[in-house]
């Protein structure tokens, strides 16, 4: 239904707290360099204006679209051109072009310092002094570093943060209470960020149809007892919600997500038997819970997939009659039978089925042609299964750090032109798949591994797009989203690469490394490892292991020495010489 004042409508639906949080996220995701105080001032102005519209929907400017209102606010910021360069040109455009322009200027890798967590005492003090400002800072800092973070989900993480602080700041040992809990939230939020970025990439590059296919597969796996019409309705609604969030329409997105959660909870009988626990929770927790609810039990009496999609004489007629519906039904039927497959794999199978029908239905005797299609799925299924087995075996043997190093070597050989920081970040993220997925039951490993890897590789592609340096990466990134992971897996050593010359300073370390936190130490060592591979792309695993063991031993020895500086300055050059010899 149309509302006289869109801003009043959203304010009423969302309530002041969520309204302000979402407006802050929106501004922080658009203008990523502005300080919290600058954004907080704008948010207050927008909120005050919204209240005047609630009081009188006919008041001046209350009938304007949210894009117009928000865009006007952003464009009124002083020194916009000095701080944001060509983004200021967006302000010369009219809506909807102006908003599209803002979206195009979102930076996936803003040059902002890493978000450092204050010490427990300091955190608790500022939280107690002003919880609202404290949470505002959290929303601002996360949103500006992750410009596509799913806004209603970020409100959920802020709520989690709030609850943890409320609980831990009352404890005697605040540090040991806060650290593991906040680390847990951070890890989940980072995964949520890359997953959502993948959804927005899907939407931006391949349109709503591609995202809806993803949603049909995912929902069919989770709700195998829901019929196709129900799954289609949920997929359509979910597509709308994600389109809005990816498009910067955060108020509409959060409002529609709440509506979708409400619908699911009112229609549990036709969706799933597993929703009740989620539906008993308050809004943010409810929507989050529904998004990761466990799979419902599969119906016991499902007929073989071949009946309707291979053996039925009407296959080509059904395909001709309503292509998207028929393929959607195939995806639904296949996905509900395979909660053990990744969504990426299910979409590859659906694509293979579509290609088979395109080819076979054009032939003189189609049934003879498409009769073997299910057998042709086998290699497509075996490939990711082997990937999971090989990588989980390696993870179990090496542990997370060793596994990350193995991936780092592999990916540096595949794309040595990519910057070392990007390779290290990618390898560390890819390596976490072991801890995240390899410990799960067998039937949950494949969907966990492949869909997580796809999301991480999407980030690799986004970073590479900014500065394309590797033909290998460009090739894999320009294909369809679901083919990316198999494409990267299939890459081998880049034979066109001219090895980097050996620079001693790259492998020269100082005593300050000793005081770094473990994570930072690992990153330093992994940076050196990537550089070694760039120097000798064809070094054997054994050679690299020898060098890295020597390096670890050197750090251990010098960090324990009484005179660390002398140890580093005398032993360092010896290490560099040994490295060169080992790789000669």
């Amino acid at each position: 239904e149309a509302h006289k004042s869109e801003i009043a409508h959203r304010y009423n639906d969302l309530g002041e707290q969520h309204f302000k949080g979402l407006v802050l996220i929106a501004f922080s995701q658009y203008l990523q360099k502005c300080s919290y105080d600058e954004h907080a001032k704008l948010v207050q102005e927008v909120t005050d204006f919204a209240k005047t519209c609630v009081a009188d929907e006919s008041a001046a400017n209350c009938d304007k679209s949210l894009h117009t209102l928000f865009g006007d606010k952003l464009c009124a910021i002083p020194n916009l051109r000095e701080n944001y360069g060509e983004l200021a040109d967006c302000c010369t455009k009219q809506e909807p072009e102006r908003n599209e322009c803002f979206l195009q200027h979102k930076d996936d890798n803003p040059s902002l310092p890493p978000f450092e967590r204050p010490e427990a005492e300091a955190m608790c003090t500022s939280f107690k002094e002003n919880p609202t400002t404290f949470m505002g800072h959290y929303l601002h800092e996360v949103a500006r570093r992750h410009p596509y973070f799913y806004a209603p989900e970020l409100l959920y993480y802020a709520e989690q943060y709030n609850e943890i602080l409320t609980q831990c700041c009352a404890e005697a040992d605040k540090e040991s209470c806060l650290t593991p809990k906040l680390d847990g939230v951070k890890e989940k939020a980072l995964v949520s960020s890359v997953r959502q970025r993948m959804k927005c990439s899907s939407m931006q590059k391949f349109g709503e149809r591609a995202f809806k296919a993803w949603a049909v597969a995912r929902l069919s796996q989770t709700f195998p007892n829901a019929d196709f019409a129900e799954i289609t309705k949920l997929a359509t609604d979910l597509t709308k919600v994600n389109k809005e969030c990816c498009h910067g329409d955060l108020l509409e997105c959060a409002d529609d997500r709440a509506e979708l959660a409400k619908y699911m909870c009112e229609n549990q009988a036709t969706i799933s038997s597993k929703l009740q626990t989620c539906c008993d929770k308050p809004l943010l927790k409810k929507a989050h819970c529904l998004s990761e609810v466990e799979h419902d039990t599969m119906p016991a009496d499902l007929p073989a997939i071949a009946a309707d999609f291979v053996e039925d004489q009407e296959v080509c007629k059904n395909y001709a009659e309503a292509k998207d519906v028929f393929l959607g039904t195939f995806l639904y039927e296949y996905s509900r039978r395979h909660p053990d497959y990744s969504v990426s794999l299910l979409l590859r199978l659906a694509k293979k089925y579509e290609a088979t029908l395109e080819k076979c239905c054009a032939e003189a005797n189609p049934p003879a042609c498409y009769g073997t299609v299910l057998a042709e799925f086998q290699p497509l299924v075996e490939e990711p299964k082997n990937l999971v087995k090989t990588n989980c075996d390696l993870y179990e043997k090496l542990g997370e750090y060793g596994f990350q190093n193995a991936i780092l070597v592999r990916y540096t050989q595949k794309a040595p032109q990519v910057s070392t920081p990007t390779l290290v970040e990618a390898a560390r993220n890819l390596g976490r798949v072991g801890t995240k997925c390899c410990t799960l039951p067998e039937d949950q490993r494949l969907p966990c591994v492949e869909d997580y890897l796809s999301a991480i590789l999407n980030r690799v592609c986004l970073l590479h797009e900014k500065t394309p340096v590797s033909e290998h990466v460009t090739k894999c990134c320009s294909g369809s989203l679901v083919e990316r992971r198999p494409c990267f897996s299939a890459l081998t050593v880049d034979e066109t690469y001219v090895p980097k010359e050996f620079k001693a300073e790259t492998f020269t370390f100082h005593s300050d490394i000793c005081t770094l936190p473990e994570k930072e130490k690992q990153i330093k060592k992994q940076t050196a490892l990537a550089e070694l591979v760039k120097h000798k792309p064809k070094a054997t695993a054994e050679q690299l292991k020898t060098v890295m063991d020597d390096f670890a031993q050197f750090l251990d020895t010098c960090c324990k020495a009484a005179d660390k500086d002398t140890c580093f300055s005398t032993e360092g050059p010896n290490l560099v010489t040994r490295c060169k010899d080992a790789l000669a």
Epitope: Q313, E314, C316, E363
Partner: nanobody
Framework: QVQLQESGGGLVQPGGSLPLSCEAS????????MTWVRWAPGKGVEWVSG????????LYADSVKGRFTISRDNAKNTLYLQMNSLKPEDTAVYYC????????GGQGTQVTVSS
Amino acid sequence: QVQLQESGGGLVQPGGSLPLSCEASGFTFSRFGMTWVRWAPGKGVEWVSGISSLGDSTLYADSVKGRFTISRDNAKNTLYLQMNSLKPEDTAVYYCTIGGSLNPGGQGTQVTVSS
């Protein structure tokens, strides 16, 4: 909505000829292989002939090989079956179908071969 409209049937003497047509609508005709099938009481549905989307490949049942010719005009969304040297056993209702289907979709056209 897919629609197939057969025409051209009638009564013909043994050894005679008949051209059948099938007008198609509601789908992208030029992308689908098409089939002629026939139905006669006591015999059930029998596959007669098939043609690929571009018309570059054709198939025939042994019982009609050398006598029947399948063709298509994608510009007119029309499928044809030229039947020569007709025999009494060719008496049936003839249907065109999409992509090898043996399920008659349209009304069909009656062909009777009798002296």
